[in-house]
């Protein structure tokens, strides 16, 4: 397409930089901004910084869960995170456990033996 | 607060989050679908554990997690703006929502990450 020879025609085109790149984030600032707008009432407005902040929070929490789940998978000598690893990571961390109350499908259970069930050495129960 | 187990409300602004289903009268009905963050979750995974993969089921769980946290933060921020009679949701409302929703050190570190990102964003404008 033949563009007009405007005052900028001689200048090299600057590459478009996404809002995520400007904020140094992986998560999509533009998309999150759109969702925030759709979540608020019709007359409500959403500032640009709200989307940046939200994206950073979501990215941080994602990194925190994946970090611990990745550690769990490495401890079990597996190279792929599964729901079980997510379960071990979340339930093994006091703060993540209190944040994520939902049941993790396929997560299994957290190993736990009640103190009262652990018999002292040499004290075997007779049937 | 417990995450809502029911289907999310339809998202107006998202083209991707909508598929059309035919109604009996011939009109198209919007069916809401949760936003997918899989691409971004994967990018973050490669930052923290470059040599580790993730199963599709685990990715689905991470996706639900991100959507759930987003809904909680957005809902709380919206309520805060409404209570304080503010017409615009800013990073201030998001920060307060985070402090209210996240426990202890998790909130402190999350706030630090949010502030850092906003500072970098505003300085690069």
């Amino acid at each position: 397409a033949g563009g007009k020879a405007g005052k900028d025609s001689g200048k090299a085109k600057t590459k478009a930089v996404s809002r995520s790149q400007r904020a140094g984030l992986q998560f999509p600032v533009g998309r999150i901004h759109r969702h925030l707008k759709s979540r608020t009432t019709s007359h409500g407005r959403v500032g640009a910084t709200a989307a940046v902040y939200s994206a950073a929070i979501l990215e941080y929490l994602t990194a925190e869960v994946l970090e611990l789940a990745g550690n769990a998978s490495k401890d079990l000598k597996v190279k792929r995170i599964t729901p079980r690893h997510l379960q071990l990571a979340i339930r093994g961390d006091e703060e993540l456990d209190s944040l994520i109350k939902a049941t993790i499908a396929g997560g299994g259970v957290i190993p736990h033996i009640h103190k009262s069930l652990i018999g002292k050495k040499g004290q075997q129960k007779t049937v | 607060p417990e995450p809502a187990k029911s289907a999310p409300a339809p998202k107006k602004g998202s083209k991707k989050a909508v598929t059309k289903a035919q109604k009996k009268d011939g009109k198209k009905r919007k069916r809401s679908r949760k936003e997918s963050y899989s691409v971004y979750v994967y990018k973050v995974l490669k930052q923290v554990h470059p040599d580790t993969g993730i199963s599709s089921k685990a990715m689905g769980i991470m996706n639900s997690f991100v959507n759930d946290i987003f809904e909680r933060i957005a809902g709380e921020a919206s309520r805060l703006a409404h209570y304080n009679k503010r017409s615009t949701i800013t990073s201030r409302e998001i920060q307060t929502a985070v402090r209210l929703l996240l426990p202890g050190e998790l909130a402190k570190h999350a706030v630090s990450e949010g502030t850092k990102a906003v500072t970098k964003y505003t300085s690069s404008k």
Partner: nanobody, 121 residues
């Protein structure tokens, strides 16, 4: 096991600068950071950095004055500028096998190095 060797402490005037170093050896650590203990006070978190992603976290009291960084030789540095008398104390290098500055800052499962004394007059 993890060995942490801290160095770089010393006497400096208020407003001056110091750079602390901490070299890690032994098993792999994912997060390194610094704590400090002022005379008669509890040990407190100062700054931390994750090894792979390079995420940093600072205590509010040092934000904007201290900078934590790392190199590929498993060494972390704490650049301390605009030092104040209240920055005086023994600085300890700490590490954790989890790549989370949050878990490092709680100080629960950390490996610890010997302290290096920083005195701001």
């Amino acid at each position: 096991q993890v060995q942490l060797q801290a160095s770089g402490g010393g006497l400096v005037q208020a407003g001056g600068s110091l750079r602390l170093s901490c070299a890690a050896s032994g098993r792999t650590v994912a997060t390194l950071g610094w704590f400090r203990q002022a005379p008669g006070k509890e040990r407190e978190f100062v700054a931390g950095i994750t090894w792979t992603a390079g995420r940093t976290y600072y205590a509010d009291s040092v934000k904007g004055r201290f900078t934590i960084s790392r190199d590929n030789k498993r060494t972390t540095y704490l650049q301390m500028n605009s030092l104040k008398p209240e920055d005086t104390g023994v600085y300890y290098c700490a590490a954790t096998s989890s790549g989370s500055t949050r878990l490092l800052s709680t100080g629960r499962d950390n490996y610890w190095g010997q302290g290096t004394l920083v005195t701001v007059s």
